[in-house]
């Protein structure tokens, strides 16, 4: 399948936001690309979010998605928000060249996203 590159490790911000780049080596001249973020925990794989975009256009996730992103050539900048400590895990970037044929699919090695819940602020007497 296609080569897909993504960083090995990302640390989410204190606000629960993690960003990483997913880059793929296209064998052909795709006009329609689908990007999916998968979370793998042990032998379970769940879809976090997905977006299809036309080359040269913006990446659009569903309104209720926890993901946003931008695309530039064969590179996709992905942002996942609303993360909590329990969401720490391996996030895999999957890229599919949907149109025109032939169909190509590539799976990244995954980005381990670490999320640390912020410490609650101690009560203050003012």
């Amino acid at each position: 399948a296609m080569h897909v590159a993504q960083p090995a490790v990302v640390l989410a911000s204190s606000r629960g936001i993690a960003s990483f780049v997913c880059e793929y080596a296209s064998p052909g001249k795709a006009t329609e690309v689908r990007v999916t973020v998968l979370r793998q925990a042990d032998s379970q794989v769940t879809e976090v979010c997905a977006a299809t975009y036309m080359m040269g256009n913006e990446l659009t996730f569903l309104d209720d998605s926890i993901c946003t992103g931008t695309s530039s050539g064969n590179q996709v900048n992905l942002t996942i928000q609303g993360l909590r400590a329990m969401d720490t895990g391996l996030y895999i970037c999957k890229v599919e060249l949907m149109y025109p044929p032939p169909y190509y699919l590539g799976i990244g090695n995954g980005t381990q996203i670490y999320v640390i819940d912020p410490e609650p602020c101690p009560d203050s007497d003012f």
Epitope: A1, M2, A25, I92, P101, P102, L105
Partner: antibody, heavy 115, light 108 residues
């Protein structure tokens, strides 16, 4: 119209060589990873090997059953992919299909290895 | 190498029946799976790509589903022209791009 036409099949003795060709038309050949798939009589499909395209440095991959004996090459200027089969065995007897990506399939060419 | 196990190896159903064929991978393959239809005496044709996407020209009664290691091909209402052998194939790198053993579908 997409077309893949295999040729070069026939009857060959064990230990001998044979070269199959697959001529493509109707699609952008250079964008495609080309595969060979075979089907022994009355059996299922077996992936034989793959040659990728220029962006992937024409990397080749083979199934364990043919590794070291079969070689895939391509000529993008002529839209042809080849399967060079050496040291043929009776178990290589099959219909050989070439595929563009895995989207397009040829009609197949029959290879019979027998003494 | 990842192994692909397809079941059943054959089935017989009536016209209009819902038919389900399963394909299991020995490891997670992330939806990197195609289904093919091979009618008697013909070359195989791509039926479903990427586990869920219907190939051009294929009837909408065919659908694919699944994730992780387990995948399913469904024919919602079997038709006489669906008599064929169906194969799954793993398309995840690295090769080999192994096929399942096939499922022969016949009409009762």
């Amino acid at each position: 119209e997409v077309q893949l036409v295999e040729s070069g099949g026939g009857l060959v003795q064990p230990g001998r060589s044979l070269r199959l060709s697959c001529t493509a038309s109707g699609f952008t050949f250079s964008d495609n990873w080309m595969n060979w798939v075979r089907q022994a009589p009355g059996k299922g499909l077996e992936w034989v090997g793959q040659i990728r395209n220029k962006p992937y440095n024409y990397e080749t991959y083979y199934s364990d059953s043919v590794k070291g004996r079969f070689t895939i090459s391509r000529d993008d200027s002529k839209s042809i992919v080849y399967l060079q089969m050496n040291s043929l065995k009776t178990e290589d007897t099959a219909v050989y299909y070439c595929t563009g990506g895995m989207d397009y399939w040829g009609q197949g060419t029959t290879v019979t290895v027998s003494s | 190498d990842i192994q692909m196990t397809q079941s059943p190896s054959s089935l017989s159903a009536s016209v209009g029946d819902r038919v389900t064929i399963t394909c299991g991978a020995s490891e997670i393959i992330y939806g990197a799976l195609n289904w093919y239809q091979q009618k008697p005496g013909k070359s195989p044709k791509l039926l479903i790509y990427g586990a869920t996407n219907l190939a051009d020209g294929m009837p909408s009664r065919f659908s694919g589903s699944g994730s992780g290691r387990d995948y399913t091909l469904t024919i919602s209402s079997l038709q006489p022209e669906d008599v064929a052998t169906y194969y799954c194939q793993k398309i995840l790198s690295p090769p080999p791009w192994t096929f399942g053993g096939g499922t022969k579908v016949e009409i009762k």
